[in-house]
């Protein structure tokens, strides 16, 4: 999906009013630190390109994180604010629904969700140059 | 039983506002989008906004904006639309209308209609 | 937002088959794949029978059909049955702050 006509200011809202909340409770109980931030993205349209690569597809180590509170609130702003992104994303995904297990919180997805904190926040800041 | 049930029939006066309210049951009210649509008599549909709960986004058509406040109680699975300086044209048949969850434009199960009539 | 453009009444025999158009601009129908249809019987709310274009809900037969070209889209309903009988809305999706506009409605008369 091609994220460039994203009503990017208005997901950002979304992001700060409540899914930045939830990304957080997710991470509550580690440290800030533990860390170290290795998935980056140049601009608007690639931060989301990479949040929802990382919030949806199955990696090893995290099967899925997309029956989370923080994935589902996502996946509402983005069906919400790119147009054409509930066809070609959550149709796809219907039939890795029906197959999905319990959740569990493993240290891999904790370390994922701590690379999605940084791609959000750096889709906050659109204006900052790649470090 | 999946259903949206509404507030009864209202009579208002010119300037006064509405609010008519709209109990989910049956599904899991936060996922799906709360559209409200009204129906003049003998006239055709006419969408005023939508409330997705989930993210709180509330979205208005721009004919109704400023006049319209669309909310909702997750705790009750309740929503409510309440419509101020009411005119003797906003006189219609008000239905809530479920949006289909994250395909939220269609709407795949309607409340059974509340008649706001607007009458000096 | 303009109302979409459908023709105030159509009509069929039993068995026939009827076509409805929808018209809109390249804001709207041809903007998206998101066009439904609603079916609505006399005092009676609305009941989705279309929705992206061409896909039917669970419940709605086969006899309802729709398509989309251009900045056209239409309901097609085939093997008229007295049932058919009612008005039919479009609606299409317009934007990120317009999730539906509708169509007048058509009245489907079953003769």
């Known amino acids: 999906y091609d994220f460039t006509n994203c009503d990017f200011e208005k997901i950002k809202a979304a992001y700060l009013s409540t899914i930045s909340k939830d990304l957080i409770t997710y991470m509550s109980g580690t440290k800030s630190t533990e860390f170290n931030n290795t998935v980056s993205c140049s601009n608007r349209p690639h931060c989301l390109t990479e949040i929802q690569s990382l919030t949806f597809n199955p990696t090893a180590g995290c099967a899925s994180l997309a029956k989370e509170m923080f994935a589902m609130k996502t996946k509402a702003a983005l069906a919400i604010w790119c147009p054409g992104y509930s066809e070609t994303q959550i149709n796809a995904t219907q039939a890795m629904k029906k197959r999905r297990k319990r959740k569990v919180t493993t240290n891999k997805c904790l370390e994922q969700v701590s690379q999605l904190q940084g791609l959000w926040r750096r889709f906050n800041r659109p204006l900052l140059k790649q470090q | 039983q999946v259903q949206l049930v509404q507030s009864g029939a209202e009579v208002k006066k010119p300037g006064s506002s509405v609010k008519v309210s709209c109990k989910a049951s049956g599904f899991t009210f936060g996922s799906y989008g709360i559209n409200w649509v009204r129906q003049a008599p003998g006239q055709g549909l006419e969408w005023l906004g939508v409330?997705?709960?989930?993210?709180?986004?509330?979205i208005y058509a721009e004919k109704f904006q400023g006049r319209v406040t669309i909310t909702a109680d997750t705790s009750t699975s309740t929503a409510y639309m309440e419509l101020s300086s009411l005119r003797s044209e906003d006189t219609a048949v008000y239905y809530c209308a479920r949006g289909q969850e994250y395909f939220y434009w269609y709407f795949d199960l309607w409340g059974q209609g509340t008649l706001v009539t607007v009458s000096s | 937002q303009s109302a979409l453009t459908q023709p105030p009444s159509a009509s069929g025999s039993p068995g026939q088959s009827v076509t409805i158009s929808c018209t809109g601009t390249t804001s709207d129908i041809g903007g998206y794949n998101r066009v439904s249809w609603y079916q609505q019987h006399p005092g009676k709310a609305p009941k989705l029978m279309i929705y992206e274009v061409s896909k039917r809900p669970s419940g709605v037969p086969d006899r309802f059909s729709g398509s989309k070209s251009g900045n056209t889209a239409s309901l097609t309903v085939s093997g008229l049955q007295a049932e058919d009988e009612a008005d039919y809305y479009c609606?299409?999706?317009?934007?990120?702050?317009?999730?539906?506009?509708f169509g007048g409605g058509t009245k489907l008369t079953v003769l």
């Open positions: 409330i997705v709960p989930l993210v709180g986004v509330t």
């Open positions: 609606s299409s999706y317009a934007g990120t702050d317009t999730f539906a506009i």
